[in-house]
């Protein structure tokens, strides 16, 4: 091997990747908020809805201070992969009532996939463990009724909104540690 020639800089570095992840998360949060509002207008929710297959919220305001980079990124990636699966399921099995929201759900899925790719690149560049912790994947069957799919959509969008909200806070806090 010859003398070191040096390499041109690639398009980004881990800190830029983290900045990009924050921007993508904020953008996705705004999209989710808007879509959830549309859902409430079209199909008013009677109280809070939940779905057993959704991940439990990872963080609360009180635990933000003790966040560690590997834990946050791994958990965020696992949770977002679950929400991606649920959005794909909604688009596939949501039924005629949700067809009117198809363009918005498609855009949401594309943004989710983009954020997941950015997080993966960040974890690769930092050389953090990427394997998702083993957890049972609950199979998503077809909704029991049209109202069932609407309730599921409310639950998915509500959960994603909360997850993205803590993600923005967590990622901004982690920026100071990288």
């Amino acid at each position: 091997p010859g003398p070191p020639a040096g390499s041109p800089r690639v398009s980004s570095d881990p800190r830029a990747d983290l900045d990009s992840a924050v921007l993508l998360t904020r953008s996705l949060l705004a999209d989710t908020r808007q879509l959830a509002a549309q859902m409430r207008d079209k199909f008013p929710a009677d109280g809070d809805h939940s779905l057993d297959s959704l991940p439990t919220l990872a963080m609360s305001a009180g635990t933000l201070g003790s966040l560690q980079l590997p834990g946050v990124l791994t958990r965020l990636r696992v949770d977002l992969m679950s929400y991606l699966r649920h959005v794909q399921w909604l688009r596939r099995a949501g039924g005629p009532s949700l067809k009117t929201l198809e363009p918005e759900l498609g855009a949401l899925q594309a943004r989710l996939e983009r954020l997941l790719r950015r997080l993966q690149l960040l974890m690769s560049r930092l050389a953090l463990p990427q394997a998702a912790p083993d957890q049972p994947v609950i199979p998503l069957g077809p909704p029991a009724s049209a109202w069932g799919s609407i309730r599921a959509a409310h639950a998915i969008l509500g959960g994603l909104h909360l997850t993205l909200d803590w993600a923005v806070r967590g990622l901004l806090l982690l920026k100071t540690r990288l």
């Epitope: 881990p14 790719r117 690769s124 930092l126 050389a127 953090l128």
Partner: antibody, heavy 114, light 111 residues
Framework: EVQLLESGGGLVQPGGSLRLSCAAS????SSWGMHWVRQAPGKGLE????????????YYADSVKGRFTISRDNSKNTLYLQMNSLRAEDTAVYYC???????WGQGTLVTVSS | QSVLTQPPSASGTPGQRVTISCTGS?????????VHWYQQLPGTAPKLLIY???ERPSGVPDRFSGSKSGTSASLAISGLRSEDEADYYC???????????FGGGTKLTVL
């Protein structure tokens, strides 16, 4: 411009030890995970080991586990590979690489032979 | 034997388009991990050509493009040039290794 400069290679007898170093410059070393990747003469690339940006995670290929140790000193912008119990099949050019890997050094040749 | 499978050789004439495939498994490409491609010119160190399936680092011509589907990926080189003659490697993170795995490499010959 990013530079990764490996050193410490050479000829060593089977069972012997070597310590490779990689001096990094031109980027924020402490923000990047670092790898060692090797290439035997006329063969393809084989990943050897990785260490996370802060040194808290270290992983090894099965072929070197228990014999090689990766470490880093972020204050010196330097990556290390301690190689013990060397075998003939460890003969290769050893590259230091950063990121996915995004950046590669020019490599240092390690020859294990009696 | 490499964890990612590539054809050992590929060839094309100047101006042609060539494609190099890379097949993985459920612990790497199939697990959703991104694929990266490297070019190694004779006697030199590998150079990152494509990262995250289809993104080009600055300075890499747009003649090079990547794609990924399921457990496989491919690198396409259009408008082939003599200076593209090199070894090309794919790589992806692997869950079972906790590190990247490389393909066996494809030697590209420009006829």
């Amino acid at each position: 411009e990013v530079q990764l400069l490996e050193s410490g290679g050479g000829l060593v007898q089977p069972g012997g030890s070597l310590r490779l170093s990689c001096a990094a410059s031109g980027f924020t070393f402490s923000s990047w995970g670092m790898h060692w990747v090797r290439q035997a003469p006329g063969k393809g690339l084989e990943w050897v080991s990785v260490i996370s940006y802060d040194g808290s995670y270290k992983y090894y290929a099965d072929s070197v586990k228990g014999r090689f140790t990766i470490s880093r000193d972020n204050s010196k912008n330097t990556l290390y590979l301690q190689m013990n119990s060397l075998r003939a099949e460890d003969t290769a050019v050893y590259y230091c690489a950063a990121g996915v890997p995004d950046y590669w050094g020019q490599g240092t040749l390690v020859t294990v032979s009696s | 034997q490499s964890v990612l499978t590539q054809p050992p050789s590929a060839s094309g004439t100047p101006g042609q388009r060539v494609t190099i495939s890379c097949t993985g498994s459920s612990s790497n490409i199939g697990a959703g991990y991104d694929v990266h491609w490297y070019q190694q010119l004779p006697g030199t160190a590998p150079k990152l050509l494509i990262y995250s399936n289809n993104e080009r680092p600055s300075g890499v011509p747009d003649r090079f493009s990547g794609s990924k589907s399921g457990t496989s990926a491919s690198l396409a080189i259009s408008g082939l040039r003599s200076e593209d003659e090199a070894d090309y490697y794919c790589a992806a993170w692997d869950d079972s290794l906790n590190g990247p795995v490389f393909g066996g490499g494809t030697k590209l010959t420009v006829l």
